[in-house]
């Protein structure tokens, strides 16, 4: 049975298909696979109709293959059983287990640190531009423009807390009203979900792993986008968030309190502060319209400084002009008086790498962006590999059952809500929804957490980050307390509203279905994942922002026809799906349109053509690098530089996506040998597929 029975066998025209959304490879053992699956008409269903890329319903398409690619893989234990080991073997196994655990923690630490550095890199590259987005107050009164500003700024600074703090400062200094700030907060919520989507891209090596990881990451995006689509018009019409938060603030007399404990930062800061430290006030100053801040560097040079309220000496025409007689003297020529001036005296320089480099922010940003992405990718591969070697057999079964099993009937419905609480709690502990969702992404990829379980965890993460913001607001000074608290509460109630919309009733869990659909498309056409990221997080917001600059009439003039077209496509797709008989024959499928308008295949051919040219050039380099890697790792069966093969061969491989077989010698003793004796059999290495397929984009 399909995950959504209401969609099963609902193809309006099963005769018309193009290639399936996924290759036949599945992690389900072969014996469980049916040779072929037929639909009610007896027609073999081995391929799926590809719907137009602009239709949201393309993402809800049922996967008609014999095996459901969303089924969690069985992680077979290839090692010797514990009972069959001698003392030496058992000792070695324990040491290896401990070693793996330490390595896992180490890579996880590096992973989190690289996320922090990635955020700093984004701020160095786009922080000033992001600040300038905020400085155009007239545009921000337009809710749609506010929304996209929130998205763009958060994407550029890779931190919703940074954009939130800018909004708070602007509201506190009356540069922005709470009403205008709400759409920006909604946008910030969307922008923060890009991090785990980037992390998911790192798992593009293996199609099924990527399918799950990308869907797991984008479930967050879809939740945020869908919530905004419903709640932004609702807020614009009723101002319910503004009214509700005002009511909460007036009902409960909030006092200043303690900020949330920075548990994760305490651990990561010592390391990340050695790499880069930023002066985030610069972005804030730009946002507040301080033109002088435009020339300041975001890179923090001085870490220790004392702020002296110094009495500055100024000359006055006579003693009558002195501040007071007690602040009046003469140096023999002029009469002087005292004025209080706050001066910052730098004492000690910061200890990060770039402190003595006089490189521009952009250069440092690009360096850090490259390095952090490489480290992020490397850590991810190693985490996946380590988890793959650890989570086998009994351990895997226990963990998967614990994470993915529901409570017994009649309390099954409570499981999701518990997951929401767990997500919120974990995010509260690590103080970052990006870190939590990004750490969860590889686990979804390797099949430890199902999408259905990842969804409430992600929703919880959204709540967790807002509770952190509420505590941060409570710890803010008196003059900003009310505005920061109201904005934090708006953020909180926005997420609560989103959960109420897209979680309680299983039928409304649209983000899961959309994410799975996107996962299917991205697994087949991996470039589409990059396209999705660029289109939804950069192109669309920038276009809307550009149109907003042109004014309301232009925005409406361009936006309304596009929205109407999307609605038309959506309605038509719905009718094709539910009751095709009421439609004219021509409209029962999309074949009346040119192929490029309803299939990704022509686009894929164009992209393949473009990448092939590039691949040919770097072919030799790729092959040499790959061979060296294989030699170092001791890999006996290594697919090097597939860019050098014939096109036909490449196509064939694309369909099959053969797993890499690596001998025991390939595996590091502390990695996936899983305590087995030297030379025992071959272990299927989960993550080497990621290495073998680095040219997917």
């Amino acid at each position: 049975m399909a995950p959504w029975p209401e969609l099963e066998n609902a193809q309006p025209n099963p005769g018309k298909f193009i290639e399936g959304a996924s290759g036949p490879q599945s992690s389900i053992p072969a014996k469980d696979k049916e040779a072929s699956k037929t639909n009610d008409n007896g027609t073999p269903v081995a391929k799926t109709e590809l719907l137009p890329s602009y239709s949201a319903l393309v993402l809800i398409e049922e996967h008609p293959e014999g095996t459901d690619p969303w089924d969690l893989p069985e992680l077979q234990d290839t090692g010797i059983k514990w009972s069959e080991r001698d003392t030496k073997g058992k000792t070695l196994c324990i040491f290896q287990g401990v070693g793996k655990f330490i390595l896992l923690l180490g890579f996880l630490y590096l992973f989190v640190c690289s996320l922090d550095v990635l955020s700093s890199a984004f701020q160095l590259v786009g922080g000033k531009v992001a600040g300038q987005f905020f400085s155009n107050n007239s545009i921000m009164s337009n809710p749609v423009a506010g929304l996209v500003i929130g998205v763009l700024v958060t994407v550029m600074v890779q931190s919703s807390s940074t954009s939130s703090s800018i909004i708070v400062s602007m509201v506190a200094s009356s540069l922005l009203t709470v009403r205008a700030a709400i759409p920006i907060i909604m946008g910030a919520n969307i922008g923060t979900s890009i991090t785990n989507t980037i992390v998911a891209l790192m798992q593009a090596g293996d199609r099924n792993e990527f399918r799950r990881a990308f869907a797991g990451a984008t479930v967050h995006d879809f939740f945020n986008w869908l919530s905004v689509f419903v709640l932004l018009p609702l807020e614009a019409a009723t101002h319910y968030l503004e009214i509700l938060t005002n009511l909460v603030l007036e009902t409960f007399k909030f006092q200043n309190g303690e900020d949330a404990p920075d548990i994760l930062k305490v651990i990561t800061d010592p390391f990340t502060k050695l790499i880069i430290q930023l002066d985030k006030k610069v972005i804030q100053q730009i946002a507040m319209g301080d033109s002088a801040a435009q020339n300041k560097s975001l890179i923090k040079i001085w870490c220790k400084s004392i702020t002296n309220v110094t009495e500055m000496n100024v000359t006055v025409p006579s003693t009558d002009n002195c501040t007071s007689p007690s602040y009046c003297w003469t140096d023999g020529i002029q009469t002087w008086t005292i004025q209080n001036v706050t001066q910052k005296e730098n004492i000690a320089k910061c200890q990060h790498i770039f402190v003595n480099f006089s490189l521009p922010d952009l250069a440092v940003g690009i360096i850090l962006l490259t390095v952090s992405l490489v480290v992020l990718c490397g850590c991810l591969i190693m985490i996946v590999k380590l988890l793959g070697s650890v989570l086998r057999g009994q351990v895997a079964t226990v963990i998967k059952k614990t994470l993915n099993t529901d409570f017994p009937f009649p309390f099954a419905w409570l499981t999701g809500y518990l997951a929401i609480l767990v997500g919120a709690g974990m995010t509260f502990i690590v103080q970052s929804s990006s870190v939590f969702t990004s750490a969860m992404t590889p686990l979804i990829g390797i099949g430890v957490i199902s999408i259905e379980r990842a969804y409430p965890l992600t929703l919880g993460s959204n709540i967790g980050t807002t509770t952190t913001a509420i505590l941060a607001a409570l710890a803010s000074p008196g003059n900003t307390l009310r505005s920061s608290l109201q904005i934090a509460l708006c953020h909180f109630f926005f997420n609560i509203s989103g959960i109420l919309l897209w979680y309680p009733i299983p039928f409304t869990r649209l983000p899961i279905r959309l994410a799975k659909g996107l996962g299917n498309i991205s697994a087949k056409y991996r470039w589409f994942a990059v396209f999705y990221l660029i289109f939804f997080f950069f192109v669309t917001p920038l276009t809307v922002f550009g149109l907003s600059l042109a004014g309301w009439p232009v925005l409406v003039g361009v936006g309304v026809p596009i929205i109407l077209l999307l609605l038309l496509v959506l309605c038509l797709r719905m009718l094709q799906f539910r009751c095709p008989r009421i439609l004219p024959l021509k409209l029962r499928d999309w074949n009346f349109l040119p192929l490029w308008m309803h299939s990704l295949k022509p686009w894929d051919n164009v992209i393949s053509l473009a990448t092939t040219c590039f691949q040919r050039r770097c072919c030799c380099c790729c092959r040499v690098c790959c061979r060296v890697c294989c030699m170092v790792c001791g890999c006996k069966c290594c697919r090097c530089s597939k860019c050098c093969r014939d096109q036909g061969e490449e196509e064939e491989e694309k369909e099959q996506d053969i797993p890499v077989k690596a001998s025991g010698a390939f595996d590091n003793a502390a990695m996936s040998k899983e305590c087995q004796d030297e030379g025992k059999g071959q272990v299927e290495v989960l993550s080497m597929k990621a290495l073998s397929n680095t040219t997917v984009f």
């Epitope: 003693t319 009046c328 003297w329 003469t330 140096d331 023999g332 020529i333």
Partner: antibody, heavy 119, light 107 residues
Framework: QVQLVQSGAEVKKPGASVKVSCKAS????????VHWVRQAPGQGLEWMGA????????SYAQKFQGRVTMTRDTSTSTVYMELSSLRSEDTAVYYC????????????WGQGTLVTVSS | DVQMTQSPSSLSASVGDRVTITCRAS??????LNWYQQKPGKAVKLLIY???RLQSGVPSRFSGSGSGTDYTLTISSLQPEDFATYYC?????????FGQGTKLEIK
Amino acid sequence: QVQLVQSGAEVKKPGASVKVSCKASGFTFTSYNVHWVRQAPGQGLEWMGAISPGNGDLSYAQKFQGRVTMTRDTSTSTVYMELSSLRSEDTAVYYCARGRTGMGAVDYWGQGTLVTVSS
Amino acid sequence: DVQMTQSPSSLSASVGDRVTITCRASQDVYSYLNWYQQKPGKAVKLLIYYTSRLQSGVPSRFSGSGSGTDYTLTISSLQPEDFATYYCQQYNIFPWTFGQGTKLEIK
């Protein structure tokens, strides 16, 4: 080191004028004010006025207004004090002293120039 | 002009003694007061500025205090090189005015 070297002793007749020089070294001449203070035999110190070598600003004590003229030569880092219409009570040791702009104290003093007014 | 009166005019003390010299202004000078030391044949030296701030290079046995119109210079333990004439000077109101001086002699 900071030095203020004054010209030698002078003997003048009543009604005459005297011009005492003060050559500065060891510091940025234009960043400080140069003050003139005199001390009559067996008496206390008496402030006469000051000049700012940087911009040429001047200030004289009311008592000496019209009789005293202070000038500066930035090329030689020298300040001059000319006192006209000398009287016997003008017999004193004349000191030049350095005072930082904005400060009401003089931290370095010259060795003094004795001006004797007698007929 | 503000009149500055020092007392005593002269003072005899022994090495190791604690000595206090007083300076009274004819009006409130709001702590804008300095102390100088003058030795025969030597340049005048600034000891304390703004009532109580010790000029660099001046021994810590010298200290100043006071407010309003009354100010004091204290030498906690008299040393042989401290025998000299001491002057107070106000700079609150133009022109600068000095006290008549206090001569400190060896007993």
